[in-house]
């Protein structure tokens, strides 16, 4: 009976999310394998988040709006492990917008989700950021490694969206 009511709850939650995400990929989690964590298909999952690589070339503002429509934000990178996971799925000859910007050009970088910008957990390429005119951050492959670079916000790039996993 308990299992039945849990299944009914899950089904109703799935139906609720289905209006936003036509398909979800879920895995069982938790010590009793009773919780399901889901990401929209074909998003990828890492720890408690889902990631989507958009190959549509758009400005930073349009890229953030695009993520927002999907219930996400441009990606906020919190650890080297997270960056390493993300870059496994990126093309080395492309650049991708991050959810990091400096809208006033004061070198006060800010994440879209208001996560505090921690200079000690940043992955700028050597010599970057290098221009107060360039107020948005991308991740690209340079000098044999993935890192961040400041660029003009209105120049279209690919982008990475991030959202919290859906738990049902």
């Amino acid at each position: 009976n308990f299992m039945y009511s849990k299944t009914v709850k899950r089904l109703s939650k799935l139906q609720e999310y289905q209006q936003y995400y036509p398909s979800l990929t879920c895995v069982m989690e938790g010590k009793d394998m009773e919780d399901w964590s889901c990401c929209p298909t074909p998003w990828t999952s890492f720890q408690s988040s889902c990631y989507f690589i958009s190959t549509v070339m758009q400005s930073w503002t349009k890229s953030q709006n695009n993520c927002s429509v999907m219930g996400a934000d441009l990606v906020v990178i919190n650890t080297k492990e997270e960056q390493d996971f993300i870059t496994q799925n990126l093309k080395i000859n492309s650049a991708y917008f991050l959810g990091l910007s400096d809208p006033k050009g004061w070198r006060h970088w800010q994440w879209v989700d208001q996560t505090p910008y921690n200079k000690n957990v940043t992955f700028w390429h050597s010599g970057e950021p290098n221009s107060p005119d360039e107020r948005c951050a991308i991740i690209n492959f340079r000098s044999e490694e993935w890192g961040w670079n400041d660029v003009h916000c209105h120049v279209p790039q690919k982008s990475i969206c991030k959202m919290k996993k859906i738990y049902i």
Partner: antibody, heavy 121, light 111 residues
């Protein structure tokens, strides 16, 4: 006072090349992103190229990509536009302009007087 | 590309009267409370001159009879009291996304 002086325009045959220069003074050129904008005779304005202050990032519309190259020499306070494989539709007055960021966008705040490029056989 | 459509193509206004120029974008050029539309004035034989940036901010040194308004996809440049020296072509421009694009221009003349 900001001054931008374009030069290098002239008459060139289709398929030919030309290099435009823009000599800048009255501001710290090396800290400014710069752009070229053109205006065909009796027509409107068309953005042609942009280069960041350090010269390591350049941007072009599809209409000139692969044919035009923007560059700069910060030691000479000069902006350049190398134009190859010129076509009749490249005939225009070419202006250089300073770029000023505005949050996530920008404005072109100072413009030179322009130099005329005519592509004709 | 973002297309900007200006109207009217030309406008004849009496001295001291109001002139209004419209600019419609093919998609929104707003983000986080700012609109990325600029207005330029071009007099015959001269380069363009920046009048308004961010849809409504008056550039330094520009007379306050010029004003800009609008958001999203619809923008307006207003000259509250037309002066003889305002005879020119006026262009809107978007800087939200490359390629930067300009409207086709509106020619303002004295009636």
């Amino acid at each position: 006072e900001v001054q931008l002086l374009e030069s290098g325009g002239g008459l060139v045959q289709p398929g030919g090349s030309l290099r435009l220069s823009c000599a800048a003074s009255g501001f710290t050129f090396s800290t400014y992103t710069m752009s070229w904008v053109r205006q065909a005779p009796g027509k409107g304005l068309e953005w042609v190229a942009t280069i960041n202050s350090g010269g390591d990032n350049t941007y072009y519309p599809d209409s000139v990509k692969g044919r035009f190259t923007i560059s700069r020499d910060n030691s000479k306070n000069t902006l350049y536009l190398q134009m190859n494989s010129l076509r009749a539709e490249d005939t225009a007055v070419y202006y250089c302009a300073t770029y000023r960021p505005y949050y996530y966008g920008s404005v072109l705040d100072y413009w030179g007087q322009g130099t005329t490029v005519t592509v004709s056989s | 590309d973002i297309v900007l459509t200006q109207s009217p193509d030309s406008l004849a206004v009496s001295l001291g009267e109001r002139a209004t120029i419209n600019c419609k974008a093919s998609q929104s050029v707003d983000y986080d409370g700012n609109s990325y539309v600029n207005w330029y004035q071009q007099k015959p034989g001269q380069p363009p001159k920046l009048l308004i940036y961010g849809a409504s901010n008056l550039e330094s040194g520009i007379p306050d009879r010029f004003s800009g308004s609008g958001s999203g996809t619809d923008f307006t440049l207003t000259i509250s009291s037309l002066q003889a020296e305002d005879v020119a072509v006026y262009y809107c421009q978007q800087s939200d996304e490359d390629p930067w694009t300009f409207g086709g221009g509106t020619k303002v003349e004295i009636k």
